[in-house]
């Protein structure tokens, strides 16, 4: 996160860290807890690393440096990448992770509400992006979970800023015209959440941007409301019945 500040314990209890253990262990992506056994993240996090066994999912944590070999983590039972996601394109950047064992909810580890299907009418004015990603383009992973308040940008405006890309209705953009605040490398898959009527909802999944926090280059997020049918289908068909935080 560029231009952000430290988060507090329990402030974003749905935020998880997706880490890979090969020879060393490192944080690669963020994710959002959406049910006892489900995490929503970005499909591109798994490019080149589709093997379930190498992943460790840490929930209920604030500081990555607190993680030791004894820190509990979740393992992956199943990775469900959107069927239309292609490595050669930037569309449908969404994936579900089914955890091997369900998580208990606590003050520091609980799910985020999902939006209603095709939610286009709600005007979100209080939106935040969180993650342990770089604090500048050529930076490094941060220890303490960062947060930043960023306004949503219309898709029309976003398309003007990204003429070489197709900004679809299944994407949502956020950023300041002058730049300075944005998600960055390592924040991928994490949440863009907005507070509406006193409740936090998962509006976007951190997907991509041209650099980080550049002027007139907003961050681009996968629009969760556009994938509600897919999320419900996959979580229900896998579970028999959904163990989801009900859509708002």
């Amino acid at each position: 996160i560029v231009g952000g500040t430290n988060s507090s314990w329990g402030e974003w209890p749905w935020q998880v860290s997706l880490q890979v253990k090969l020879t060393a262990q490192r944080h690669l992506c963020g994710g959002s807890l959406i049910g006892h056994q489900w995490v929503l993240t970005a499909a591109h996090c798994f490019d080149g690393l589709p093997l379930q066994d190498v992943w460790r999912i840490y929930s209920g944590i604030l500081n990555l440096s607190d993680i030791t070999k004894d820190t509990p983590f979740s393992q992956i039972k199943e990775i469900i990448i959107h069927q239309n996601y292609k490595v050669s394109e930037g569309n449908h950047d969404i994936a579900l992770i089914k955890l091997q064992a369900p998580l208990n909810y606590t003050e520091f580890q609980k799910p985020i509400c999902l939006p209603s299907k095709g939610d286009t009418s709600t005007i979100y004015t209080n939106c935040w992006v969180t993650g342990w990603g770089f604090s500048k383009e050529k930076g490094e992973i941060q220890n303490i979970l960062q947060k930043v308040n960023i306004p949503l940008v219309t898709n029309e405006e976003c398309q003007k800023r990204y003429q070489d890309y197709k900004i679809t209705q299944r994407m949502v953009c956020a950023g300041y015209k002058e730049g300075g605040k944005d998600a960055c490398k390592g924040d991928s898959g994490g949440p863009l959440v907005c507070k509406h009527n006193g409740m936090w909802r998962l509006v976007g999944i951190t997907s991509w941007g041209e650099g980080c926090a550049r002027r007139e280059q907003p961050g681009v997020y996968t629009k969760v409301a556009e994938y509600m049918d897919w999320i419900l289908e996959k979580t229900q068909s896998s579970d028999g019945k959904a163990q989801m935080q009900s859509p708002a």
Epitope: H44, D47, V87, E89, G90, Y165, K166, S188, S207
Partner: antibody, heavy 125, light 108 residues
């Protein structure tokens, strides 16, 4: 199967014009940025131009700026290169290529993942 | 413009040997925008490596790419007969997009 097929090459006199076409199949053409690359006989590869998925944004190499025009017809899945005021140094095999633009570590990637077989343009009197 | 300088110009090696090809850029290039292509005589170029280190679909694991910033390397761990040809690095970080002049890998 993803395929690109160029046509329209041939022999043309200096100062003349030629229009190259590139027919795309096997993928959603309107989702992809497309590019032209050329290769003079016995030489290396030279990027010529690219066009955005909608066709609204184009960029050219200095060597062809003002003389060449890239365009596309998404309804026909076809890419074009209109070449005017041709010079001897434009003699080359012209390739069209699809520009893949995935995502890695929250940044876009960019690379030419599919190439046509090429069409030879010879500029000579 | 970003200049791409490949070395050596020609590499003469026997099958089974290791080939190391270098590509230097005149300015910082985001790794996501650095690719390597192989071209054999009379054929169109073929994508080998994208994002500086990711192998394209169908490319054998004897091909690997590394590097960051201004120094990039393509390595062929054990040369096979079909690997002989010319290799190009290319950047699309900034326009104009540019290619290196190529490294020719020939049979010793």
């Amino acid at each position: 199967e993803v395929q690109l097929l160029e046509s329209g090459g041939g022999l043309v006199q200096p100062g003349g014009s030629l229009r190259l076409s590139c027919a795309a199949s096997g993928f959603t053409f309107s989702h992809y940025l497309m590019t032209w690359v050329r290769q003079a006989p016995g030489k290396g590869l030279e990027w010529v131009s690219y066009i955005s998925p909608s066709g609204g944004h184009t960029i050219y190499a200095d060597s062809v700026k003002g003389r060449f025009t890239i365009s596309r017809d998404n309804s026909k899945n076809t890419l074009y290169l209109q070449m005017n005021s041709l010079r001897a140094e434009d003699t080359a095999v012209y390739y069209c290529a699809r520009v893949a633009r995935g995502i890695a570590a929250r940044s876009r990637t960019s690379y030419f993942d599919t190439w046509g077989q090429g069409t030879l343009v010879t500029v000579s009197s | 413009d970003i200049q791409m300088t490949q070395s050596p110009g020609t590499l003469s090696l026997s099958p089974g040997e290791r080939a190391t090809l270098s590509c230097r850029t005149s300015q910082f290039v985001n790794s996501n925008y650095l690719a390597w292509y192989q071209q054999t005589p009379g054929q169109a170029p073929r994508l080998l490596i994208y994002g500086a280190s990711s192998r394209a679909t169908g490319i054998p694991d004897r091909f690997s790419g590394t590097g960051y910033g201004t120094d990039f390397t393509l390595t062929i761990s054990r040369l096979e007969p079909e690997d002989y040809g010319t290799y190009y690095c290319q950047q699309s970080s900034r326009t104009p997009w540019t290619f290196g002049q190529g490294t020719r890998v020939e049979i010793k």
